[in-house]
């Protein structure tokens, strides 16, 4: 038997993926475990193999269908179970009734690009990936810019309280290398959380013209 504290957390990307992490203090090290998803309104079910991500936590992705297919809706409830092999049988280690649209975490924004750059400002755009049509415009974004000599953690957060897939960064230093990241969150869902940060976009401001004030 496994003793200790267990935590089983899953998020739906709003289309066709449920990502789960299972943590167990004093967990079995060499045991095969999986997550099984059983929607109560659907004819399909899905399984993924839990793989170690640290000493006492495992993760896996339930791929429900084609990336942009709408496999679950606001009224679906999915029974999620962690099953671990014990000899010839499977033992239920954790179970939850999962409401997908109460537990959302979207994919990181993609296709970041510099639309226009000047000496002191830069206009950047991006796209959201695999986001449900249910949200319409009910999304918000956070962005951050990495300045030379600073860390991401020190970067101030810029909040966009609407579905706005661009930003104009102001008061930048001329001829300076920056990096930019953005993340997205639906307004819907009691346990919804921010997406991962996008891949950083590197850009450089234009040098100040000679003889001009900066």
């Amino acid at each position: 038997a496994v003793n200790g504290t267990s935590q089983f957390t899953c998020f739906y990307n709003s289309r066709a993926n449920i990502s789960c992490v299972w943590s167990q203090d004093g967990a079995l090290q060499d045991t095969s475990c999986q997550v099984h998803a059983w929607p109560d309104r659907r004819r399909w079910n899905q399984t993924c193999e839990l793989l170690p991500v640290s000493q006492a936590s495992w993760a896996c992705n339930l791929i429900l269908g084609a990336p942009d297919s709408q496999k679950l809706t606001t009224v679906d409830i999915v029974t999620l179970r962690v099953l671990c092999r014990e000899g010839v049988r499977w033992r239920v280690m954790a179970i939850q009734d999962f409401k997908p649209f109460e537990n959302l975490r979207l994919m990181a924004p993609i296709s970041l690009q510099v639309v226009h750059v000047e000496t002191h400002r830069c206009n950047i755009s991006w796209e959201i990936s695999q986001a449900s049509h249910y949200f319409e415009r009910h999304l918000e974004f956070e962005a951050r810019t990495l300045s030379p000599g600073h860390t991401w953690e020190e970067a101030p957060l810029l909040t966009l309280k609407q579905k706005q897939e661009w930003i104009c960064l102001e008061t930048l230093t001329p001829d300076t290398q920056y990096e930019f990241q953005v993340r997205v969150k639906p307004l819907q869902g009691e346990f919804t959380t921010w997406s991962p940060w996008s891949q950083p976009l590197a850009f450089r401001t234009k040098p100040a013209a000679l003889g001009k004030d900066t």
Epitope: R41, S69, Q70, K71, T73, V75, I77, T79
Partner: antibody, heavy 112, light 107 residues
Framework: EVQLVQSGGGLVQPGGSLRLSCAAS????????MSWVRQAPGKGLEWVSA????????HYADSVKGRFTISRDNSKNTLYLQMNSLRAEDTAVYYC?????WGQGTLVTVSS | DIQLTQSPSSLSASVGDRVTITCRAS??????LNWYQQKPGKAPKALIY???NLETGVPSRFSGSGSGTDFTLTIISLQPEDFATYFC?????????FGQGTKVEFK
């Protein structure tokens, strides 16, 4: 073999009440959401209500909201529909259903 | 609510004919569309689930296709026992909604 066996239909006066039952067998009842669907004489099908597998979530058609209550007893593998304040327009054959399996239907007649 | 528009409302056919019935949804329902056969005084019988999957025990002359908003039920060679009413159901989201039905009659 999957079976959904219905009972509880009959003749009732307007304003009256009736409770329909649907006994399930041949599948893991608690793993499936269940619905009630009705069909008025000579008409098409109309969804009435649904309940999640655990019973914790319910949904109703606007036409029955506040009058009908869906419930389930997973220990008895049984689905229920409590119908109150019945009207003439509720007259229909009522089916308990999942998309794959339907009960045999039970006739509810609301008439004075 | 999602509307399902089924056509034709009726058709006349002979044994051995190929029959095609269509169902169009007012918005995308992914692949969550089911087809049923109903005979007078009987409960509906499931034929196809999730747009294209044949229910257990249903003859292979029945097939379904489509996704998003446009769906088709095809009977490749109509048999005497196939004369009935057919309808589609979306179970993508509540409320479930149904097509108006297609009555397949003897020519």
């Amino acid at each position: 073999e999957v079976q959904l066996v219905q009972s509880g239909g009959g003749l009732v006066q307007p304003g009256g009440s009736l409770r329909l039952s649907c006994a399930a067998s041949g599948f893991t009842f608690s793993s499936y959401a269940m619905s009630w669907v009705r069909q008025a004489p000579g008409k098409g099908l109309e969804w009435v209500s649904a309940i999640s597998g655990s019973g914790g979530s319910t949904h109703y058609a606007d036409s029955v909201k506040g009058r009908f209550t869906i419930s389930r007893d997973n220990s008895k593998n049984t689905l229920y529909l409590q119908m109150n304040s019945l009207r003439a327009e509720d007259t229909a054959v009522y089916y308990c259903a999942t998309p794959a399996f339907w009960g045999q239907g039970t006739l509810v007649t609301v008439s004075s | 609510d999602i509307q399902l528009t089924q056509s034709p409302s009726s058709l006349s056919a002979s044994v051995g004919d190929r029959v095609t019935i269509t169902c169009r949804a007012s918005q995308s329902i992914s692949s969550y569309l089911n087809w049923y056969q109903q005979k007078p005084g009987k409960a509906p019988k499931a034929l196809i689930y999730d747009a294209s999957n044949l229910e257990t025990g249903v003859p292979s002359r029945f097939s379904g296709s489509g996704s998003g908003t446009d769906f088709t039920l095809t009977i490749i060679s109509l048999q005497p026992e196939d004369f009935a009413t057919y309808f589609c159901l979306q179970d993508y989201i509540y409320p479930w909604t149904f097509g108006q039905g297609t009555k397949v009659e003897f020519k």
